[in-house]
Amino acid sequence: KKKEKVKKGSECSEWTWGPCTPSSKDCGMGFREGTCGAQTQRVHCKVPCNWKKEFGADCKYKFESWGACDGSTGTKARQGTLKKARYNAQCQETIRVTKPCTSKTKSKTKAKKGKGKD
């Protein structure tokens, strides 16, 4: 949030302004709300439509912890459950992601016969 000094004869000297929230989809004309003590103001603002979205990915997931390293593939996996989707985003309910085990994990796995942790 932005803070701004205002000197227009009002009792409020420091307004705190929230983000510009488009009225339509992710960009274009919208409103920014400001507060100062008990006072609130709403002003018009614009989010340019050529900006990249600041809100992150269309699909947000909540992930479990990484599973154990699979020695045969050198990867480990975890599952994600859909937490939030942009209104028109057709997101999978659950996803599975994998990544390579670290070299440290691989060496531990070999040394401790599959009991390595990451």
């Epitope: 009225s23 989707a85 985003a89 999978q92």
Partner: antibody, heavy 117, light 107 residues
Framework: QVQLVQSGGGLVKPGHSLRLSCAAS????????MNWVRQAPGKGLEWIGM????????ILNQKFKDKATLSVDIAKNSAYLQMNSLRAEDTAVYYC??????????WGQGTLVTVSS | DIVLTQSPATLSLSPGERATLSCRAS??????LHWYQQKPGQAPRLLIY???QSISGIPARFSGSGPGTDFTLTISSLEPEDFAVYYC?????????FGGGTKLEIK
């Protein structure tokens, strides 16, 4: 499959407030947008607004900015619509619906709100 | 706000006939257009979403076309249970808006 059961409707006097409830069961309530729509007797459908249970992000039809307040209670798997300063023209059946762009939506059975003195 | 205009307001047909319902948007809404069926005393039921995508459990006789500003819901061969009111809805921008509805009645 998501099941939505609505409650809280009834007869209310002009100027009073009312809170409608929408209780969800089945698949994860917190992952999907919850819409509120109303339908006056013999009329078409009108969107009031929507809320996402995961973070309570709310998008309200500006027509209802001084009339409606949306909220959720994740612990109770429920969404709420608070309607203030009710007038005769707010008489309608109010629906909640859970929306996923991946699988479509599920609707509550609707609850009738009658504003009359 | 995006205005959705449905036509005709009333459509009188017989079972077995083909029904074509129109929905026109006041500006381009890509494919963010959905079709609902509503029967008296019931909540709306989603038939087609994103202009032409079918919904699980909805009979194959229902189909939709788009995108852009002109959208069509087609019922290839009417069954007695299809006589109801049909609404289009856009989700391209807020506020979400509905068309005024088309009443499909038995001739």
């Amino acid at each position: 499959q998501v099941q939505l059961v609505q409650s809280g409707g009834g007869l209310v006097k002009p100027g009073h407030s009312l809170r409608l409830s929408c209780a969800a069961s089945g698949q994860s309530f917190s992952s999907y947008w919850m819409n509120w729509v109303r339908q006056a007797p013999g009329k078409g459908l009108e969107w009031i607004g929507m809320i996402h249970p995961s973070d309570s992000e709310t998008i309200l039809n500006q027509k209802f900015k001084d009339k409606a307040t949306l909220s959720v209670d994740i612990a109770k798997n429920s969404a709420y619509l608070q309607m203030n300063s009710l007038r005769a023209e707010d008489t309608a059946v109010y629906y909640c619906s859970s929306w996923s762009a991946k699988r479509g939506d599920f609707w509550g059975q609707g609850t009738l709100v009658t504003v009359s003195s | 706000d995006i205005v959705l205009t449905q036509s005709p307001a009333t459509l009188s047909l017989s079972p077995g006939e083909r029904a074509t319902l129109s929905c026109r948007a006041s500006e381009s809404i890509s494919n963010n257009l959905h079709w609902y069926q509503q029967k008296p005393g019931q909540a709306p039921r989603l038939l087609i979403y994103y202009a032409s995508q079918s919904i699980s459990g909805i009979p194959a006789r229902f189909s939709g076309s788009g995108p852009g500003t002109d959208f069509t819901l087609t019922i290839s061969s009417l069954e007695p249970e299809d006589f109801a009111v049909y609404y289009c809805q856009q989700s391209n921008s807020w506020p979400l808006t509905f068309g005024g509805g088309t009443k499909l009645e038995i001739k």
